[in-house]
């Protein structure tokens, strides 16, 4: 189920790459965030808290990512036209409950000016 398009700027371009921003409520302590391209999982990041509030970050499908208190950024490099597609942030909230899955996304348009290594 697609819950809706992101209500924020999801794609930030720089240096021939793109930062894809996946937000989550900052009250959330334990979660899994997956980046989907179409229906395919490109990246994931899981944050859990153990005893003594020790934080564990795991990735099964590793991408360069950055975690803040309310978002996960995934970075894609060397953009080419094949990157143009629908991208979705698939958030699974574990804690605090209730367990909840939301899917939000948008279309990544690739323009000449954003390509990594443009042919002159």
């Amino acid at each position: 189920e697609i819950n809706g398009s992101a209500n924020y700027e999801m794609f930030i371009f720089h240096n021939g790459g793109v930062q894809i921003l996946c937000k989550y409520p900052d009250i959330v302590q334990q979660f899994k965030m997956q980046l989907l391209k179409g229906g395919q999982i490109l990246c994931d990041l899981t944050k859990t808290k153990g005893s003594g509030n020790t934080v564990s970050i795991k990735s099964l499908k590793f991408c360069h990512s950055q975690l803040s208190n309310n978002s996960v950024s995934f970075f894609l490099y060397n953009l080419d036209r094949s990157h143009a597609n629908y991208y979705f942030c698939n958030l699974s909230i574990f804690d605090p409950p209730p367990f909840k899955v939301t899917l939000t996304g948008g279309y990544l348009h690739i323009y000449e000016s954003q390509l990594c290594c443009q042919l002159k």
Partner: antibody, heavy 121, light 106 residues
């Protein structure tokens, strides 16, 4: 149906502590976190904090750190909040509220009826 | 702290009249929720995620907005809408409520 049943009104002296309760029914208690909210004439509504029944993790509004302590007893499906070193400014109605999520954020989807705490000598 | 300012603080409307109340945030928020509170009862979830109506809320209610400015609108005022309405932001710690708009009927 889903209900949050709160304990009765409390009249306490300045400097004392009070522990109020919120019992959940009509749903699986451990499947939701619980928030506490203060309502006073002076400050309208204020979020105090939340306790995860799943992990016992707590998240306090810094303003209430040291004033409020949230705990939970899973066996009786009850959340508790203790208020310490009471002053007249703590006189208010205290609500528990069940946590839920929308697509973008979280909110209180069910509220208790409130517990009135009066601090007076 | 993100201060939510609701205006007007008190308003009255005639039956059938359109009503709009606003909630202004000192810092931008991703979404706003609204609660309705009738006298001597606890608040009830009324609108969540800016524009979604909670279960049992009449269709004459709607919510909109983004960034620093949000609003709740009643397309046609009815007597049962008399209450105080509070906005709430849960997108930036510490989570805050507005001071409320008290809606009365003429």
């Amino acid at each position: 149906q889903v209900q949050l049943q709160q304990s009765g009104p409390e009249l306490v002296r300045p400097g004392e502590s009070v522990k109020i309760s919120c019992m959940g029914s009509g749903y699986t208690f451990t499947d939701y976190a619980m928030h506490w909210v203060k309502q006073s004439h002076a400050k309208s509504l204020e979020w105090i904090g939340l306790i995860s029944i799943y992990s016992d993790h707590t998240n306090y509004n810094q303003k209430f750190q040291g004033k409020a302590t949230m705990t939970v007893d899973k066996s009786s499906s009850t959340a508790y909040m203790e208020l310490a070193r009471l002053t007249s400014e703590d006189s208010a109605i205290y609500y528990c509220g069940r946590n839920n999520y929308g697509n973008y954020g979280w909110y209180f989807d069910v509220w208790g009826a409130g517990t009135t705490v009066t601090v007076s000598s | 702290e993100n201060v939510l300012t609701q205006s007007p603080a008190i308003m009255s409307a005639s039956p059938g009249e359109k009503v709009t109340m606003t909630c202004s945030a000192s810092s931008s928020v991703s979404y706003m929720h609204w609660y309705q509170q009738k006298s001597i009862t606890s608040p009830k979830l009324w609108i969540y995620d800016t524009s979604k109506l909670a279960s049992g809320v009449p269709g004459r209610f709607s919510g909109s907005g983004s960034g620093n400015s949000y609003s709740l609108t009643i397309s046609s005022m009815e007597a049962e809408d008399v209450a105080t309405y509070y906005c709430f932001q849960g997108s930036g710690y510490p989570y805050t409520f507005g001071g409320g708009t008290k809606l009365e009927i003429k």
